[in-house]
Amino acid sequence: EEELQVIQPDKSVLVAAGETATLRCTATSLIPVGPIQWFRGAGPGRELIYNQKEGHFPRVTTVSDLTKRNNMDFSIRIGNITPADAGTYYCVKFRKGSPDDVEFKSGAGTELSVRAKPSAPVVSGPAARATPQHTVSFTCESHGFSPRDITLKWFKNGNELSDFQTNVDPVGESVSYSIHSTAKVVLTREDVHSQVICEVAHVTLQGDPLRGTANLSETIRVPPTLEVTQQPVRAENQVNVTCQVRKFYPQRLQLTWLENGNVSRTETASTVTENKDGTYNWMSWLLVNVSAHRDDVKLTCQVEHDGQPAVSKSHDLKVSAHPKEQGSNTAAENTGSNERNIY
């Protein structure tokens, strides 16, 4: 009679995480008498998955009734599969022995691969804000997927980006994998409303990719442009000077008026107007009592935006054309910012 062979007909089996894996195994003979055991791995570190003779294996069920005398089907089902279950499974026939059963013949092994979905991509931008024309890096990470093959794309406002580098780890075989990608994005002044999107496609997602987004409003700083103008004289000795602060983002802004280098007033941008592109405009004005000045006045609008070094714009106020009012020593009125846009 021909010697018993252990047949594992499936070289590989692919199962989605959470599903049940069926590992097939048949023997070609009832002799020698002895139990079957299933192992993951062939080496000294192999792990016992099922022992026909003894033990408790709650996730494993047999396909046929192993208690029947003439049974030669030793296939098993493993429930609730996770990526950690990946590996090569061996169906091993033991020969009855005393005191211990002796390993007799192994099947060729069935490689169990687990399909696991990637986690939702997490996109993160730079720690500090950057200004238009600068290049910033965004990272995208997704974890826990299997098999290793995966596609990652970057978009900015629907336009695909090309300047990025992607790594899938680990390089060798693993139960599951992670992807890490870094994209470079050049900022423009119009990017306050822009979004950067990382899109991950994987066989487990059935053509419906996962997306992670980052708003460039968290990343961009648009510095303001300043314009100081002198309005027509309101009263005999008063001049209205306005400082237009335009196209800035974010809103955090402090403005200081200086008269001939001396601080006249400091205020914080509160009631701003929003532009279509998401940037803000704001205006502050100063009433200058020209009769208090013998000489020309240098008025400076100094703006500190989002904790950056101050930028300023100056305006020379000619006072020689105005008659001096005796007894006045007030250089400027501490008015609040004008909520009306005066152009």
């Epitope: 570190g45 192999r46 590996g87 013949k105």
Partner: antibody, heavy 115, light 110 residues
């Protein structure tokens, strides 16, 4: 003891089978691994087989090597040798060990792959 | 793939001295202790020194000491003898059923 045999000069692409003969053990349970060492290089694990004949391989070795068991030997087949496969091939036995260590080694057999 | 990084590549010490070799695994070895150390001399097969990360193999002097767990392991050779001049390899065993070696460390005894 374990002893390798079959090492020789072969031309690239010509399959070669090495044998590892095991003697002097009551073989209730053992594992035999094949390891190679290129001249002046380190040890490189190829794969392993157990007494029942179940074999597994290093990822780089899959398809390039086949480990099988006969009644008297454990064989390593180099399916399509290249000059990079030139090395001394060792078979190493893990006997009575449960931590993946190989405590019995053969002297090695030299394989040279050259035109 | 699982990678075992051995440092240093070469070390020199005087007779009676102590040598420490490090072996770092890219992932935890199986059961945190599937790590062995071997000694190899030119023209000879490797000889098992330590298994299970810290257990001395039969006939190996107690001057050889293995320690560590998980991903970081150390072989220490104290009271160095001239006969200890050799190349030393670590070997890990992994859940994925592979048993690779580190790159080796040459020990020179002065």
């Amino acid at each position: 003891s374990v002893e390798e045999s079959g090492g020789r000069l072969v031309t690239p692409g010509t399959p070669l089978t090495l044998a590892c003969t095991v003697s002097g053990f009551s073989l209730i349970s053992y594992y035999i691994s094949w390891v190679r060492q290129a001249p002046e290089k380190g040890l490189e694990y190829i794969g392993i087989i157990n007494i029942g004949g179940g074999a597994s391989y290093a990822s780089w070795a899959k398809g390039r090597f086949t480990i099988s068991k006969t009644s008297t030997t454990v064989d390593l087949k180099i399916t399509s040798p290249t000059p990079e496969d030139t090395a001394t091939y060792f078979c190493a036995m893990s006997y009575g060990m449960d931590t993946g260590a190989f405590n019995i080694w053969g002297p090695g057999t030299l394989v040279t792959v050259s035109l | 793939a699982q990678v075992l990084t051995q440092t240093p590549a070469s070390v020199s010490a005087a007779v009676g001295g102590t040598v420490t070799i490090s072996c770092q695994s890219s992932e935890s070895v199986y059961k945190n202790n599937f790590l062995s150390w071997y000694q190899q001399k030119p023209g000879k097969p490797p000889k098992l020194l330590i298994y299970g990360a810290s257990t001395l193999a039969s006939g190996v002097p107690s001057r050889f000491k293995g320690s560590g767990s998980g991903t970081q392991f150390t072989l220490t050779i104290s009271d160095l003898e001239s006969d200890d001049a050799a190349t030393y390899f670590c070997q890990g065993g992994y859940r994925t059923d592979i048993y690779p070696f580190g790159g080796g460390t040459e020990v020179v005894v002065k």
